[in-house]
């Protein structure tokens, strides 16, 4: 009975990143977290932006960075495509600026492959949004 080969993929244990179309990941993630608990802690700081609703792709995008997709067939984690990153950034960066913050360097879109192909696999996301969202003000108490 030899040693079992180390599991390549682990179940996603972060609640906000479950039921997004893939369910396994492998750490470290694309920003260097070794543990899912650390990734979740960082992800929670984006809750105000997610609730604001600047982009329907934001949650998927963040999860693809903090818990990238894993497949037994490929050794490297599969993160977001640059196109999805740019789409999310275009819609959410102005909102972040309203809060007083800049787009994080850790989410620099140039770090991600421009598109999904055999050489550089990445996730395109749940569909681009071309319809402009109505302007939303920051969520007030009692609003959902």
């Amino acid at each position: 009975f030899g040693d079992e080969e180390e599991r390549r993929c682990d179940p996603i244990r972060i609640s906000m990143c479950q039921n997004l179309g893939y369910n396994v990941t492998k750490m470290p993630n694309l920003v260097g977290h070794e543990l899912q608990t650390d990734a979740e802690l960082q992800l929670t700081t984006f809750t105000p932006l997610i609730q604001y609703g600047c982009s329907s792709q934001l949650q998927f995008f963040l999860c693809s960075v903090y818990v990238p997709m894993c497949t037994e067939k490929i050794n490297i984690p599969i993160g977001p495509c640059g196109g999805m990153c740019l789409s999310v950034k275009r819609r959410c960066e102005p909102v972040l600026k309203e809060f007083g913050f800049a787009w994080p360097e850790s989410l620099n879109c140039s770090k991600f492959p421009p598109q999904n192909d055999h050489n550089h696999m990445c996730m395109e996301g749940p569909g681009d949004e071309e319809v402009p969202l109505p302007h939303k003000t920051p969520i007030q108490p009692g609003e959902e």
Epitope: T44, Q51, P104, I139, E143
Partner: antibody, heavy 118, light 107 residues
Framework: EVQLVESGGGLVQPGGSLRLSCAAS????????MHWVRQAPGKGLEWVAS????????YYADSVKGRFTISADTSKNTAYLQMNSLRAEDTAVYYC???????????WGQGTLVTVSS | DIQMTQSPSSLSASVGDRVTITCRAS??????VAWYQQKPGKAPKLLIY???SLYSGVPSRFSGSRSGTDFTLTISSLQPEDFATYYC?????????FGQGTKVEIK
Amino acid sequence: EVQLVESGGGLVQPGGSLRLSCAASGFNLSYYYMHWVRQAPGKGLEWVASIYSYSGYTYYADSVKGRFTISADTSKNTAYLQMNSLRAEDTAVYYCARSSFAWAFDYWGQGTLVTVSS
Amino acid sequence: DIQMTQSPSSLSASVGDRVTITCRASQSVSSAVAWYQQKPGKAPKLLIYSASSLYSGVPSRFSGSRSGTDFTLTISSLQPEDFATYYCQQGGWGPFTFGQGTKVEIK
């Protein structure tokens, strides 16, 4: 406009209890980490406790663990700090603060003074 | 717990001077380090977040940088309203911890 207003401070004897309130306006407290930070007279800042209502997370400094309880009433958009078994070294101005992106404490209340003395 | 050792504890400077304040983390930390300014009787105000990002509305004479476990706040040209106490703070990993503070006084 974002505002945090603390209340509930005052003079209390050692071993006594006090409950501080932090009324938030201009944002939904549920989606943010809310913190209590204190500052003893003439001293520096000391983090006390944090709550993230959205997931029910609470965190405490070792110096207050087991004595202080942080909570929030999201219907009132208010955070609380229940302080029990108070000691002289708990004397400080207590600030309520919000953090959002990158763990930065971007908004602070004006502070409320807690004096523990016999 | 991660300790943030801030130096110097106080300094005297003149208007127009370049001022540098350093915080050293006791172990490796993320870049979730912020700097605050506090004036007597007032709440702290956020200046810098993520080690080097300038918070909205803060004058550009304030800047932050990181080198390993050393975090630095620089005021390029000290103004009369900058005389205050400055604190660093790390967050996101274990308890939030503040530096001891640096009081910037008029020479």
